[in-house]
Interface confidence: low
């Protein structure tokens, strides 16, 4: 394992405290506790973190002191299980405390909630935030870590430290600026959007490890790192994949101190060996640790080596294909994936994995046949339709996006997905379809060579959100099937779903379409969400409604909101005009 082979330490907690330093140690313990006990008040978590930190210091002073030899899971689990209100607040999660390690930690992991019942974070006035920041900077930043971690229980902990550093920098700069709001608000918006994206990307990594196993994650990592570092040797990529898998397994498993420590070691190794990895790492490697790790994770693909030979020679034409495959199946398939991915930065990772799976299936079948070479000779021909399917889909959807713009493109997807899986809750359909719709502005601006990796890998992240939210309360067999059968075929599985003909339309409820004057004070985004929620409900009432019918109703709805928001007596307008709108909509849709 190279980087991660460490000497045995008498005290694991002392070792991590010394490696990470007090500030990072405290921040990571706070993140870990907030991700496990998502409902606990901030003050309770701070108290627990301080107790753990004091204990860690005693172990640094004397590694042989009492309890210093205990594992981190034992120490942290014991501390979490001292929370007095565990049973009342968390119900059956309290049963975890009756278990021994490692089962207790596994039990806590099982109870992480992707959609916790927490109030939406409301941003206070800028002056209020700046005062709080100046009054107690440490508490202010801890609160940020706590609020993000409890809402995103799989957030990549070392990356959250990087976000907190940027959060601090934004307040340090902007609270002294002449126009505090103009300086601060765009920075906070950017951090919020980037944070949501980072959380969703990490959630997919954890789902990949937890649901499909280490082999699936390693395959993903081989493909992605081979695209990013096409000049690196296969052995180098394999080593990075092994180390990266360890880092993410630790973070997804709640071992945040080990994860952060190992991520720092991996960044150090990459920078010490950049000559044999990539020519694009120079700037990243000059940055401080948190920025360096983030930069490496986001670094652009290196240029492909010139004159790479044809893949067919080693993987189709060679007489030794079956011999090489039989000797070490996963290594041979890994080499295939590496060679294919380094030649194709223009493909999505999931497409590369589909190609590798097709290649594997063909070899399994053909290496047992009478004439293996004859059998697998045309294997690359089987790749053509697999490549064309996402290319065509992206082309069509980018054309639609360019024609409609983001909001209406989202609406088209809302209708499409509600018809496919109408049993899914309306908030989930709105959230997921809005995010699916963002693929347009995110990826369609790119040239052809960058569109597919941008679009399809982003869609994998968004569809994973649907999968984890649906798993909490499963309502649709079709969603379960697409989410669980194959990680790399999730998007094609959802794309292939037609209208659910078995769905019994929802009863019409006028209350769902009753609006009030408060809609006028909402931001544009919030108003869009209200309208999109109504659109999903319409489709659930009338799944066979045509595009034209739905468009007419939505246009009427937009006009109604605009009219009443301009009226002197807004509430009366919403009440009277709303009744007319509901009646007209029912007539238009034949409800």
């Amino acid at each position: 394992r190279g980087v991660f082979r460490r000497d045995a330490h008498k005290s694991e907690v002392a070792h991590r405290f010394k490696d990470l330093g007090e500030e990072n140690f405290k921040a990571l313990v706070l993140i870990a506790f907030a991700q496990y006990l998502q409902q606990c008040p901030f003050e309770d978590h701070v108290k627990l973190v301080n107790e753990v930190t004091e204990f860690a210091k005693t172990c640094v002073a004397d590694e042989s002191a009492e309890n210093c030899d205990k594992s981190l899971h034992t120490l942290f689990g014991d501390k979490l299980c001292t929370v007095a209100t565990l049973r009342e607040t968390y119900g059956e999660m309290a049963d975890c405390c009756a278990k021994q390690e490692p089962e207790r930690n596994e039990c806590f992991l099982q109870h992480k909630d992707d959609n916790p019942n927490l109030p939406r974070l409301v941003r206070p006035e800028v002056d209020v935030m700046c005062t709080a920041f100046h009054d107690n900077e440490e508490t202010f930043l801890k609160k940020y870590l706590y609020e993000i971690a409890r809402r995103h229980p799989y957030f990549y902990a070392p990356e959250l430290l990087f976000f907190a550093k940027r959060y601090k920098a934004a307040f340090t700069e902007c609270c002294q600026a002449a126009d505090k709001a103009a300086c601060l608000l765009p920075k906070l918006d950017e951090l919020r959007d980037e944070g949501k994206a980072s959380s969703a990307k990490q959630r997919l990594k954890c789902a990949s490890l937890q649901k499909f196993g280490e082999r699936a994650f390693k395959a993903w990592a081989v493909a992605r790192l081979s695209q990013r570092f096409p000049k690196a040797e296969f052995a180098e990529v394999s080593k990075l994949v092994t180390d990266l898998t360890k880092v993410h397994t630790e973070c997804c498993h709640g071992d945040l101190l080990e994860c952060a420590d190992d991520r720092a070691d991996l960044a150090k190794y990459i920078c010490e060996n950049q000559d044999s990895i990539s020519s694009k790492l120079k700037e990243c490697c000059e940055k401080p640790l948190l920025e360096k790790s983030h930069c490496i994770a986001e670094v652009e693909n290196d240029e492909m080596p010139a004159d790479l030979p044809s893949l067919a020679a080693d993987f189709v034409e060679s007489k030794d294909v079956c011999k090489n495959y039989a000797e070490a199946k996963d290594v041979f398939l890994g080499m295939f994936l590496y060679e294919y991915a380094r030649r194709h930065p223009d493909y999505s990772v999931v497409l590369l994995l589909r190609l590798a799976k097709t290649y594997e299936t063909t070899l399994e079948k053909c290496c047992a046949a009478a004439d293996p070479h004859e059998c697998y000779a045309k294997v690359f021909d089987e790749f053509k339709p697999l490549v064309e399917e996402p290319q065509n889909l992206i082309k069509q959807n980018c054309e639609l996006f360019e024609q409609l713009g983001e909001y209406k493109f989202q609406n088209a997807l809302l209708v499409r997905y509600t018809k496919k899986v109408p049993q899914v809750s309306t908030p989930t359909l709105v959230e997921v379809s809005r995010n699916l719709g963002k693929v347009g502005s995110k990826c369609c601006k790119h040239p052809e060579a960058k569109r597919m990796p941008c679009a399809e890998d982003y869609l994998s992240v968004v569809l994973n959100q649907l999968c984890v939210l649906h798993e909490k309360t499963p309502v649709s067999d079709r969603v379960t099937k697409c989410c669980t059968e194959s990680l790399v075929n999730r998007r094609p599985c959802f794309s292939a779903l037609e209208v659910d003909e078995t769905y019994v339309p929802k009863e019409f409820n006028a209350e769902t379409f009753t609006f009030h004057a408060d809609i006028c004070t909402l931001s544009e985004k919030e108003r869009q969400i209200k309208k999109q929620t109504a659109l999903v409900e319409l489709v659930k009432h009338k799944p066979k409604a045509t595009k034209e019918q739905l468009k007419a109703v939505m246009d009427d709805f937009a006009a109604f909101v605009e009219k009443c928001c301009k009226a002197d007596d807004k509430e009366t307008c919403f009440a009277e005009e709303g009744k007319k709108l509901v009646a007209a909509s029912q007539a238009a849709l034949g409800l």
Partner: nanobody, 126 residues
Framework: EVQLLESGGGLVQPGGSLRLSCAAS????????VAWFRQAPGKEREFVAG????????YYADSVKGRFTISRDNSKNTLYLQMNSLRPEDTAVYYC???????????????????WGQGTLVTVSS
């Protein structure tokens, strides 16, 4: 390729106990997610209990929680199902199933398990 062989089924009175075993060969059992399913006459195959690959994270169907315990002995490459407080409705053929790739989480969907044993019959009757 994983081969699975169940044993330990039989006739038992209501309230009694049985311990099923599933011996695996061809792959280390701790590298696969393994589960017990059961199928009663005329009914669909249903998930009973499961354990993740690489870590001992366990899952149970609501109908058996508190009565059944799944475990594995890596040194013997064997999966177990300890069944206590048995009821007549537990009567079924019990199957052991494996899903390689070290998934940490067990799936409850039978179709996702490529490897199956031949089953062992458990009859609960007075």
């Amino acid at each position: 390729e994983v081969q699975l062989l169940e044993s330990g089924g039989g006739l038992v009175q209501p309230g009694g106990s049985l311990r099923l075993s599933c011996a695996a060969s061809g792959r280390y059992i701790d590298e696969t997610a393994v589960a017990w399913f059961r199928q009663a006459p005329g009914k669909e195959r249903e998930f009973v209990a499961g354990i993740g690959g690489g870590v001992d994270i366990t899952y149970y169907a609501d109908s058996v929680k508190g009565r059944f315990t799944i475990s594995r002995d890596n040194s013997k490459n064997t999966l177990y199902l300890q069944m206590n407080s048995l009821r007549p409705e537990d009567t079924a053929v019990y199957y052991c199933a494996a899903r390689p790739g070290r998934p940490l989480i067990t799936e409850k969907v039978a179709d996702l398990y490529p490897y199956w044993g031949q089953g062992t019959l458990v009859t609960v009757s007075s």
